[in-house]
Amino acid sequence: LPAQVAFTPYAPEPGSTCRLREYYDQTAQMCCSKCSPGQHAKVFCTKTSDTVCDSCEDSTYTQLWNWVPECLSCGSRCSSDQVETQACTREQNRICTCRPGWYCALSKQEGCRLCAPLRKCRPGFGVARPGTETSDVVCKPCAPGTFSNTTSSTDICRPHQICNVVAIPGNASMDAVCTSTSPTRSMAPGAVHLPQPVSTRSQHTQPTPEPSTAPSTSFLLPMGPSPPAEGSTGD
C-alpha cells in the first residue's frame, strides 16, 4: 500500500527531514509549511495549526520560500547617477546599476552601491583600456605619429594624416596640417570611439515619474569628479 500523504503540520518520522517547501518548527516539533516568495510568516505553526502567511508589506520583499516573521526591506531608491534595472516588488529587491558614462566603484551583492563618472582622457591622451560596468577608463599618452584632440572617455589616439607638404606638424594633441595640396593618405573624419559599457534597463515600467535629480539616501550618493589621473580630467 502506498504511504499516506501527510498534511502539514505533521511530526516527521525519526531521522527523516521535512519535505520541499516545509520547515521543521523547533517549538511545535512539527513539519510546517513555508511561505511562498512575496510572503512571510504572520503566525507560526503549532501542533494543530499550520503556518499562516501574509503578503509582504509595501517596499519589502522575500525572494525565497521562507518562514521569516518579517519581509526584508527593499534598498533605497536609485540615485541620479543610476538606473533601476529591477524594481522593488514583493518577490525581489530593487537593483540599481550605473547609468551610461559611469562605472561601479563599490558594488554590492546585486547592483551597485556607489557609482563614479568614467575618467575622460584629455587632449594628448587616448583610451588605453575602455571603461566597463565595474572598472574605470585607463588613459595613455598618444605615441609619436598619433594624436587625440578631445576630452573623452571613449576616444583613442588616431594616426596623424600624412601630407605631401606639411604646413604644421602634428603633435600628441593635434593632427598634422597639410598645405593646400591634398594629403596622400588621410584618416576618415570624426573621432574613433570605443564602445561604452551599456547599463541594462529594466523591463519593469514603474508608473512613478522617477525624479531625475534625486540622489538617494544611504550609500547611493553620487560621487564628485574623480581625481585626475595622468592624462585624465576630472570634469
Partner: antibody, heavy 120, light 108 residues
Framework: QVQLVQSGAEVKKPGASVKVSCKAS????????MHWVRQAPGQGLEWIGR????????KHDPKFQDRVTMTSDTSTNTVYMELSSLRSEDTAVYYC?????????????WGQGTLVTVSS | DIQMTQSPSSLSASVGDRVTITCTAS???????LHWYQQKPGSSPKLWIY???NLPSGVPSRFSGSGSGTDFTLTISSLQPEDFATYYC?????????FGQGTKVEIK
C-alpha cells in the same frame, strides 16, 4: 499623464454615509496603493486608510475601524471610500493619493479633493 | 501610533532668509519612510521631499532634507515668494501612518 479625479462635493446629515470615488488614469493600477487622507477646515492632514486596487487588500487607522470601507473596481480604475455614521467632525476635504510599491509610501500624486460637509 | 511633532507650528520669514523646519517622531523612523509635503491654500498637497533627503523633479534645489532616527529637518536655503506654504512631514514606518500637524511659512 497621471491623473486622479475625485467625485464632487457632498452634503450629508449626521448618521448618514458618504461614498467618495477616485478615478485613476495615466498609469497601471498594478503595484500601487491608493490612500485616503482627509483635512478638516483649517487643520492638518489625517491618514484614513489605503487599498491595494489589484487585490482589494485594505489597511486603515483603527480610529475608523467600524466606519470606513475601501473598495476598488479594476475595470474602471476607480477606488471608493465609504464613511458611515457621519458626525459633524467628519466635515473635511477627502483626498485620494497614490504611492507606488517600493517607494516607501511616498504619495506622489493626489486627487483634487472632495469636500464632505456633515450638517443637520 | 507614531506621533509626528513639527516645530515651529508657524513662522514668519522674509524672502532670502534661511528657514529650518523640524519634525520629531515619538519613536524611531527609518529614513526611507520619512517624507515631506507642501500644500498651498485651496490646493492638494504635493510630494516635496521623499525618503528624508530626496527631491522629486520640479522641486527647487534650495530645498533640502536631512535627519535620522527621531529627528528630521526640512531646510530652505534662501526663501522665495513661491515657498510660502504649509509643510507636513509624514511617516510610513509603522501603521497607522501619520502626518505632523504642519508648519505654516508666512511672509514677514
Amino acid at each position: 499623464q497621471v491623473q486622479l479625479v475625485q467625485s464632487g462635493a457632498e452634503v450629508k446629515k449626521p448618521g448618514a454615509s458618504v461614498k467618495v470615488s477616485c478615478k485613476a488614469s495615466g498609469f497601471n493600477n498594478k503595484d500601487i496603493y491608493m490612500h485616503w487622507v482627509r483635512q478638516a477646515p483649517g487643520q492638518g492632514l489625517e491618514w484614513i486608510g489605503r487599498i491595494d486596487p489589484a487585490t482589494g487588500n485594505t489597511k486603515h487607522d483603527p480610529k475608523f475601524q467600524d466606519r470606513v470601507t475601501m473598495t476598488s473596481d479594476t475595470s474602471t480604475n476607480t477606488v471608493y471610500m465609504e464613511l458611515s455614521s457621519l458626525r459633524s467632525e467628519d466635515t473635511a476635504v477627502y483626498y485620494c493619493a497614490r504611492s507606488p510599491y517600493g517607494d516607501f509610501g511616498a504619495m506622489d500624486y493626489w486627487g483634487q479633493g472632495t469636500l464632505v460637509t456633515v450638517s443637520s | 501610533d507614531i506621533q509626528m511633532t513639527q516645530s515651529p507650528s508657524s513662522l514668519s520669514a522674509s524672502v532670502g532668509d534661511r528657514v529650518t523646519i523640524t519634525c520629531t517622531a515619538s519613536s524611531s523612523v527609518s529614513s526611507n519612510y520619512l517624507h515631506w509635503y507642501q500644500q498651498k491654500p485651496g490646493s492638494s498637497p504635493k510630494l516635496w521631499i521623499y525618503s528624508t533627503s530626496n527631491l522629486p523633479s520640479g522641486v527647487p534645489s534650495r530645498f533640502s532634507g536631512s535627519g535620522s532616527g527621531t529627528d528630521f529637518t526640512l531646510t530652505i536655503s534662501s526663501l522665495q515668494p513661491e515657498d510660502f506654504a504649509t509643510y507636513y512631514c509624514h511617516q510610513y514606518h509603522r501603521s497607522p501612518w501619520t502626518f505632523g500637524q504642519g508648519t505654516k511659512v508666512e511672509i514677514k
